[in-house]
C-alpha cells in the first residue's frame, strides 16, 4: 500500500500516512503529496533546511530516518520492495537559492534488492533539470559511509557525504551536506544536481517522489 492507494481510497489531503510493505503487515510512515501533478505521490526523500544529518549508515538508509513532515529518507528496503511489485515513475523536484525550480521525471524506476546493493534502475528522462541524467546511467549500487560500493578508488560517500548511487563519483548527490544561502556555491560536497546547476552549487530544497506508472 502506497500513497497512490491511499489517494484512491479517498484521502486526498497532503500529509503523513501509514503505508505497509508489500505482502506484509510491516508498516512505515511516509509523507504523501496528494496535490502535485494529480496526487498519489509517495515522498521518498526531502531536503529543505539542513535539520537532519544525512551522513548515515547503510542500516539507517535501509530502514529510513528523519521526520516525514520535514527532512527524511523513507528507506531503501521499502522502496525496493514497492518498486519491484509494479512499474513506478520517479519525479525529482529541485529548488535553487534564486527562486528557480526544476524537475526530472523518469518513466521507469526501481531499486534492486539489498543483496544487489539497492542498485538504481532508471529509464525515460524528461523534465527541466537537464537533458542528461544527473543520476549516472546505467544505474549504480547504493553507497554509504560504511558501505562503499561506488566505482571510485576513493570513497565517494566519505568525500561527498551522504548515501547515494555514486559512480566515480558522478554528477549528483541529493544527500550531501546542506549549505545555507550565500554559503552554497563552490561547495564540493553539497546537494548537487550537475546537469541543472553545474559544479559546486548546493541546492536549497529537493524532493524525490514515486508513483505507479499506471496511476
Amino acid at each position: 500500500r502506497d500513497c497512490a492507494e491511499v489517494f484512491k481510497s479517498g484521502h486526498t489531503t497532503n500529509g503523513i500516512y501509514t503505508l505497509t510493505f508489500p505482502n506484509s503487515t510491516e508498516e512505515i510512515k511516509a509523507y504523501c503529496d496528494m496535490e502535485a501533478g494529480g496526487g498519489g505521490w509517495t515522498i521518498i526523500q526531502r531536503r529543505e533546511d539542513g535539520s537532519v544529518d544525512f551522513q548515515r549508515t547503510w542500516k539507517e538508509y535501509k530502514v529510513g530516518f528523519g521526520n516525514p513532515s520535514g527532512e527524511y529518507w523513507l528507506g531503501n528496503e521499502f522502496v525496493s520492495q514497492l518498486t519491484n511489485q509494479q512499474r513506478y515513475v520517479l519525479k525529482i523536484h529541485l529548488k535553487d537559492w534564486e527562486g528557480n525550480e526544476a524537475y526530472s521525471l523518469y518513466e521507469h524506476f526501481y531499486l534492486s534488492s539489498e543483496e544487489l546493493n539497492y542498485r538504481i534502475h532508471l529509464k525515460g528522462l524528461t523534465g527541466t533539470a537537464g537533458k542528461i541524467s544527473s543520476i549516472s546511467q546505467p544505474g549504480n549500487d547504493f553507497s554509504t559511509k560504511d558501505g562503499d560500493n561506488d566505482k571510485c578508488i576513493c570513497k565517494c560517500s566519505q568525500m561527498l557525504t551522504g548515501g547515494w548511487w555514486f559512480d566515480a563519483c558522478g554528477p549528483s548527490n541529493l544527500n550531501g551536506m546542506y549549505y545555507p544561502q550565500r554559503q552554497n556555491t563552490n561547495k564540493f560536497n553539497g546537494i548537487k544536481w550537475y546537469y541543472w546547476k553545474g559544479s559546486g552549487y548546493s541546492l536549497k530544497a529537493t524532493t524525490m517522489m514515486i508513483r505507479p506508472a499506471d496511476f
Epitope: 566515480a168 558522478g170 560536497n189 548537487k192 553545474g198
Partner: antibody, heavy 121, light 107 residues
C-alpha cells in the same frame, strides 16, 4: 586517449594582453572543468582560476580578478585564458589542466604541455 | 584561502631509499588532497588523489596517507626516474592552492 594541446610561445610587451588556447580531445568536454595554472621560472605552481566545460561558470583567484578571463568553445572543445595588462612578473609557463567537474573533483589530470609567455619591453 | 605548507623543501636520497614528503593544510581538508610529480621542462603529473588513491598507471611504490590537515607522500624504494619536484594541492575549496614543492634529488 585524453589530450590537451596548448597554443605556442608568446612574447608580449608590458601592458598588452595574451590569449592562450587549450584544445581538448578524447573525452566528453561538458563533463569536465579546466584550471589554469602558471609557473614562473624556477618557481612553484600558482592557480589562476577555473572554468566549467558544462556551463561556463568561472572562479578566479583573487589576485587575478579583473585581469583574467576564461572562456570555452564547446563546438571546438577548446578552453581559453586571456590575461590583460601584462607585467614583467607575468612571465611564466601557463598550463591548462582538466578536472572531473561533474564529480566536483578538482584534481588535475591531464595537463597541457604548457605555453611560455614572456613579457618584456 | 587555504595555505599548504610542504616539507622538506628539498631532499637528496639514494636509490632504494624511502622518501617521505609531508604537507600541512591551514584548515581541514577531509581527504581532498592530491600529489603531483613534475620533471624539469614538463607539465606536472597526477600521482595520487583523494589523499591516498593511486592514479591509474602510477607505480605502487608511491603511496599517500593522511586526512584533515596532515598528509604525506611516501616513495618506497626510490628509483632513478623519481627525481623531480613534488607538489601537494588541496581540492577542498576554491581557490585551489598548491604547496611550495619538494625537490627530490638522487644521490
Amino acid at each position: 586517449q585524453v589530450q590537451l594541446v596548448q597554443s605556442g610561445v608568446e612574447v608580449k610587451k608590458p601592458g598588452a594582453s595574451v590569449k592562450v588556447s587549450c584544445k581538448t580531445s578524447g573525452y566528453t568536454f561538458s563533463n569536465n572543468g579546466f584550471s589554469w595554472v602558471r609557473q614562473a621560472p624556477g618557481q612553484g605552481l600558482e592557480w589562476l582560476g577555473w572554468i566549467s566545460g558544462y556551463n561556463g561558470n568561472t572562479n578566479y583567484a583573487q589576485k587575478f580578478q579583473g585581469r583574467v578571463t576564461m572562456t570555452t568553445d564547446t563546438s571546438t572543445s577548446t578552453a581559453y585564458m586571456e590575461l590583460r595588462t601584462l607585467r614583467s612578473d607575468d612571465t611564466a609557463v601557463y598550463y591548462c589542466a582538466r578536472d572531473q567537474d561533474y564529480s566536483n573533483f578538482h584534481w588535475l589530470d591531464p595537463w597541457g604541455q604548457g605555453t611560455l609567455v614572456t613579457v618584456a619591453s | 584561502d587555504i595555505q599548504m605548507t610542504q616539507s622538506p623543501s628539498s631532499v637528496s636520497a639514494s636509490v632504494g631509499d624511502r622518501v617521505i614528503i609531508t604537507c600541512r593544510a591551514s584548515q581541514g581538508l577531509s581527504s581532498w588532497l592530491a600529489w603531483y610529480q613534475q620533471k624539469p621542462g614538463t607539465a606536472p603529473k597526477l600521482l595520487i588523489h583523494s589523499a591516498s588513491s593511486l592514479q591509474t598507471g602510477v607505480p605502487s611504490r608511491f603511496s599517500g596517507s593522511g586526512s584533515g590537515t596532515e598528509f604525506a607522500l611516501t616513495i618506497n624504494s626510490l628509483q632513478p626516474e623519481d627525481f623531480g619536484t613534488y607538489y601537494c594541492q588541496q581540492a577542498n575549496s576554491f581557490p585551489l592552492t598548491f604547496g611550495g614543492g619538494t625537490r627530490v634529488e638522487i644521490k
